[in-house]
């Protein structure tokens, strides 16, 4: 007996071939001997089966001696043995229909779980193997679960169902809802405008929800809400914003915030949360602000940084085109009695400059100029 595997919702063609290459009489029946369809000359005749409106054949193949049974919009319950009667012969085909569905929404938040459920006909014993977009394989029986979804799990999951040495492949598109970056850091000189961007790692037709940016300034004892906003069909509207700092927010995606001035009192880290409509849980992105200030007070040239810096970052003061006068893994460095000229304060990581501030030291009778 020939075995054919089908996918729920798909179309399947069960073949039946006569030895004569011409149109002759044929009939398709199910295991209960109920007639599904057959021919009478050029015409199709249909029986009282439950397949009536979904069963068909292909007239253009009859003259080739091929009399297929085509079943559209397959259902699990179409799984059966189908018998083709042609030329006093009987051809049996066993059809097994499988379905694979994500038992929750296919749009899941980062960190959530994905469960795939296999629908299979009674008496079948299939095995399932799924391959994630990042190449991770998972195996199981009727259900497969993946916990702690990551951004790289977004994309097409390919699942293969094996039964009777035959296989059928399912493709399920999973969208992991997350920000493109879990964390970002912005380095700014004091007084500069600060741009914070929170690009999403997914695109959907309509995006509705609400969000908030909480900020923990390095100098402050507790965090405070800087801004709250709504998102409706990808349009952003600000609900509430603090007076200090007075943040501005872009009206379109990606989420974009502007801090008019980088000041030491704003240096610190923030957490932007986004709650999406009809989703449990929130999306998070951490953002950090490091602010640099270079000053000269009397005979002391000082460079300071505020905000979350890693211990391996190096802060240096150097006269332009000369070796660093001072270089420390600290948040403040200074030079006493600096020579006249253009001094550079540099914050660097393994030789790569992250932030630079220049200050002009004038001969001792003048006051310093900050370019």
């Amino acid at each position: 007996k020939k075995v054919v595997l089908g996918k729920k919702g798909d179309t399947v063609e069960l073949t039946c071939t006569a030895s004569q290459k011409k149109s002759i009489q044929f009939h398709w029946k199910n295991s209960n001997q109920i007639k599904i369809l057959g021919n009478q000359g050029s015409f199709l005749t249909k029986g009282p089966s439950k397949l009536n409106d979904r069963a068909d054949s292909r007239r253009s193949l009859w003259d080739q001696g091929n009399f297929p049974l085509i079943i559209k919009n397959l259902k699990i319950e179409d799984s059966d043995t189908y018998i083709c009667e042609v030329e006093d012969q009987k051809e049996e085909v066993q059809l097994l229909v499988f379905g694979l569905t994500a038992n929750s929404d296919t749009h899941l938040l980062q960190g959530q779980s994905l469960t795939l459920t296999l629908e299979s006909p009674p008496g079948s014993s299939p095995s399932v193997q799924c391959r994630s977009p990042r190449g991770k394989n998972i195996q199981g029986g009727k259900t497969l679960s993946v916990s702690q979804l990551e951004l790289q799990d977004s994309g097409t999951w390919t699942c293969t169902v094996l039964q009777n040495q035959k296989k059928v492949e399912f493709k399920i598109d999973i969208v992991v809802l997350a920000f493109q970056k879990a964390s970002s850091i912005v380095y700014k000189k004091e007084g500069e405008q600060v741009e914070f961007s929170f690009p999403l790692a997914f695109t959907v037709e309509k995006l509705t929800g609400s969000g908030e940016l909480w900020w923990q300034a390095e100098r402050a004892s507790s965090s405070k809400s800087w801004i709250t906003f709504d998102l409706k069909n990808k349009e952003v509207s600000v609900k509430r914003v603090t007076q200090d700092p007075k943040l501005q927010m872009g009206k379109k995606l990606p989420l974009h915030l502007t801090l008019p001035q980088a000041l030491p009192q704003y240096a610190g880290s923030g957490n932007l949360t986004l709650a999406l409509e009809a989703k449990t849980g929130k999306l998070h992105q951490e953002v950090n602000l490091v602010v640099m200030r270079a000053t000269q007070l009397q005979k002391n040239l000082t460079c300071e940084v505020w905000g979350p810096t890693s211990p391996k970052l190096m802060l240096s003061l150097k006269l332009e085109n000369k070796e660093a006068k001072v270089s420390k893994r600290e948040k403040a460095v200074w030079v006493l009695n600096p020579e006249a000229g253009m001094w550079q304060c540099l914050l660097s990581d393994s030789g790569q400059v992250l932030l630079e501030s220049n200050i002009k030291v004038l001969p001792t009778w003048s006051t310093p100029v900050q370019p």
């Epitope: 798909d10 179309t11 063609e13 007239r59 253009s60 085509i70």
Partner: antibody, heavy 126, light 107 residues
Framework: EVQLLESGGGLVQPGGSLRLSCAAS????????TSWVRQAPGKGLEWVAV????????YYADSVKGRFTISRDNSKNTLYLQMNSLRAEDTAVYYC???????????????????WGQGTTVTVSS | DIQMTQSPSSLSASVGDRVTITCRAS??????LNWYQQKPGKAPKLLIY???SLHSGVPSRFSGSGSGTDFTLTISSLQPEDFATYYC?????????FGGGTKVEIK
């Protein structure tokens, strides 16, 4: 948007080979028989080959039998036409076309080409 | 193989005219007949399937009739966008075959 997009055409010498591809999008590719139809310059339409849903059944026009092979990769939503031993008379625009089955309760569904690609030009010349 | 013969091979008509194109099959094909429209440099478009059923999106000025061996495509009132070549095609038997085409030109 439901569409078919052919590629792979070009200039080839008689006796040479060419492989055409047709990328399907916007519909369940595996639920349709798919054909190649060609049109020689200034001439009418000529059906070339057809392939069944899963690729197990293939039928060809006598003019290409034994030289052309139709195949499909449902996982990639792509139809192919491998053309070998090309002749000058194979010069044409090659279209891939989706077949839709228009059924009724009393007759076998009529198959018609409801979606066509934009065509890819094959020129066989020395 | 089933031969499909279209007539006329070309015709000249004016906007607003009623146009009739015929297609004859070399053997009975019941109603396994489709009609297509093709404009220069473009792919064909399905107009009518199963001899008389209008494909979705096709204007109602197009109609088809016939059964067995003789079929007709009628354009009740020719519009400027209807100047094109029209093909019939049978899906009764493999190989699938097309008629030679009828070119409808502006008079």
């Amino acid at each position: 948007e439901v569409q078919l997009l052919e590629s792979g055409g070009g200039l080839v010498q008689p006796g040479g080979s060419l492989r055409l591809s047709c990328a399907a999008s916007g519909f369940t590719f595996s639920n349709h028989y798919t054909s190649w139809v060609r049109q020689a310059p200034g001439k009418g339409l000529e059906w070339v080959a057809v392939i069944s849903y899963d690729g197990s059944n293939k039928y060809y026009a006598d003019s290409v039998k034994g030289r052309f092979t139709i195949s499909r990769d449902n996982s990639k939503n792509t139809l192919y036409l491998q053309m070998n031993s090309l002749r000058a008379e194979d010069t044409a625009v090659y279209y891939c076309a989706r077949e839709e089955k228009y059924s009724s309760s009393w007759y076998v569904g009529v198959d018609a080409f409801d979606i066509w690609g934009q065509g890819t030009t094959v020129t066989v010349s020395s | 193989d089933i031969q499909m013969t279209q007539s006329p091979s070309s015709l000249s008509a004016s906007v607003g005219d009623r146009v009739t194109i015929t297609c004859r099959a070399s053997q009975s094909i019941s109603t396994y007949l489709n009609w297509y429209q093709q404009k220069p440099g473009k792919a064909p478009k399905l107009l009518i399937y199963a001899a008389s059923s209008l494909h979705s999106g096709v204007p109602s000025r197009f109609s088809g009739s016939g059964s067995g061996t003789d079929f007709t495509l009628t354009i009740s009132s020719l519009q400027p966008e209807d100047f094109a070549t029209y093909y019939c095609q049978q899906s009764y038997s493999t190989p699938l075959t097309f008629g030679g085409g009828t070119k409808v030109e502006i008079k």
